[in-house]
């Protein structure tokens, strides 16, 4: 399965809408700063494509799922929310289309599945800091700079992948 | 690989102004903060100021506000630290460094290889 | 500011002693605390971030220690090239601050 070359460049536009999403001075928010435990190695070059798909979609689904709450709304500009909505949205349908090919399936079922519930994890114990933190501004912050980070290392993944056929 | 080359060694007069620059290479320049560091002779490490180069953002230690300026352009990675009027106390090696921001990951992990500027009459 | 203070100032080690270097931070800084070690004409080098992570490339040898206030870098057994100056640096709020430098020195 060929992702489009569209997909690449909604994910830069993706990382794009992250950074101006701002709102204070990050100068402040060092004492915020937490280690989520990012499942780099759920992302490392040592997968096949079929076997990265699924827990590529599980990563853009979790990062919509965090920032489609009511407290996400409070927390950030609505007009690049609904823009941010759109290209998450894009992209989980570019990598459904994959999966629905049926790409993978019977490859590695359970290392696939491990992979996912790492991803999962991770995105509880983002929540977890944010509800701990009582969502402040800081705390959504860190939050966004994580996922911008997270983010562009599981896109990094895709360029590779291309890169490799 | 991940490397900031710093501009070279500068002789200057008190009263002049000058630029020097930190150059990054090897990573994205604007995911990491660029942070300046000032070393007097035989002395120790001091905190000066600090830049986010996706927005040029500033902070500054207290002691340097006002003394330094510190900027960045993005276009071509570099951040640089620059005086209107040089003293001669102002003559000292001076480092870049890049942190990671709000990101959890070694703070200061890279440096420059320092410029030394001197001011004398 | 926070103010960081570094003990001893200096002291004289030989290779393979066990060295111990505190740093006490004026107010509580949690576990955001670095550790760096300069050489002569050198650049720092980042020996250990957030109190007690080793960086990479960093050998064994070295580990951090603490929270709060009160932090400790310890080098379990000494090798030459260790002889250098050591400082730590708080990284929980602006202005970053550094302590004034432990010198270890040849015996």
């Known amino acids: 399965c060929d992702l489009p070359q569209t997909h690449s460049l909604g994910s830069r536009r993706t990382l794009m809408l992250l950074a101006q999403m701002r709102r204070i001075s990050l100068f402040s928010c060092l004492k915020d700063r937490h280690d989520f435990g990012f499942p780099q190695e759920e992302f490392g070059n040592q997968f096949q494509k079929a076997e990265t798909i699924p827990v590529l979609h599980e990563m853009i689904q979790q990062i919509f799922n965090l920032f489609s709450t009511k407290d996400s709304s409070a927390a950030w500009d609505e007009t690049l929310l609904d823009k941010f909505y759109t290209e998450l949205y894009q992209q989980l349908n570019d990598l459904e289309a994959c999966v629905i090919q049926g790409v993978g399936v019977t490859e590695t079922p359970l290392m696939k599945e491990d992979s996912i519930l790492a991803v999962r994890k991770y995105f509880q114990r983002i929540t977890l800091y944010l509800k701990e933190k009582k969502y402040s501004p800081c705390a959504w912050e860190v939050v966004r700079a994580e996922i911008m980070r997270s983010f562009s290392l599981s896109t990094n993944l895709q360029e590779s992948l291309r890169s490799k056929e | 690989e991940v490397q900031l080359v710093q501009s070279g060694a500068e002789v200057k007069k008190p009263g002049e102004s000058l630029k020097i620059s930190c150059k990054g290479s090897?990573?994205?320049?604007?995911?990491?903060?660029i942070g300046w560091v000032r070393q007097m002779p035989g002395k120790g490490l001091e905190w000066m100021g600090i830049?986010?180069?996706?927005?040029?953002?500033?902070a500054y230690s207290p002691s340097f506000q006002g003394q330094v300026t510190i900027s960045a352009d993005k276009s071509i990675s570099t951040a640089y630290l620059q005086w209107s009027s040089l003293k001669a106390s102002d003559t000292a090696m001076y480092y870049c460094?890049?942190?990671?921001?709000?990101?959890?990951?070694?703070?200061?992990?890279?440096w420059g290889q320092g410029t030394l500027v001197t001011v004398s009459s | 500011d926070i103010q960081m203070t570094q003990s001893p100032s200096s002291l004289s080690a030989s290779v393979g002693d066990r060295v111990t270097i505190t740093c006490r931070a004026s107010?509580?800084?949690?576990?955001?605390l670095n550790w760096y070690q300069q050489k002569p004409g050198k650049a720092p080098k980042l020996l250990i971030y957030?109190?007690?992570s080793l960086q990479s490339g960093v050998p064994s040898r070295f580990s951090g220690s603490g929270s709060g206030t009160d932090f400790t870098l310890t080098i379990s057994s000494l090798q030459p090239e260790d002889f250098a100056t050591y400082y730590c640096?708080?990284?929980?709020?602006?202005?970053?601050?550094f302590g004034q430098g432990t010198k270890v020195e040849i015996k």
């Open positions: 460094a890049r942190h990671p921001g709000l990101n959890w990951a070694p703070d200061f992990d890279y």
């Open positions: 090897g990573y994205s320049f604007t995911s990491y903060w």
């Open positions: 830049i986010d180069p996706s927005d040029s953002d500033t």
């Open positions: 107010q509580s800084i949690n576990r955001f």
């Open positions: 957030a109190a007690s």
């Open positions: 640096q708080q990284a929980i709020d602006l202005p970053f601050t």
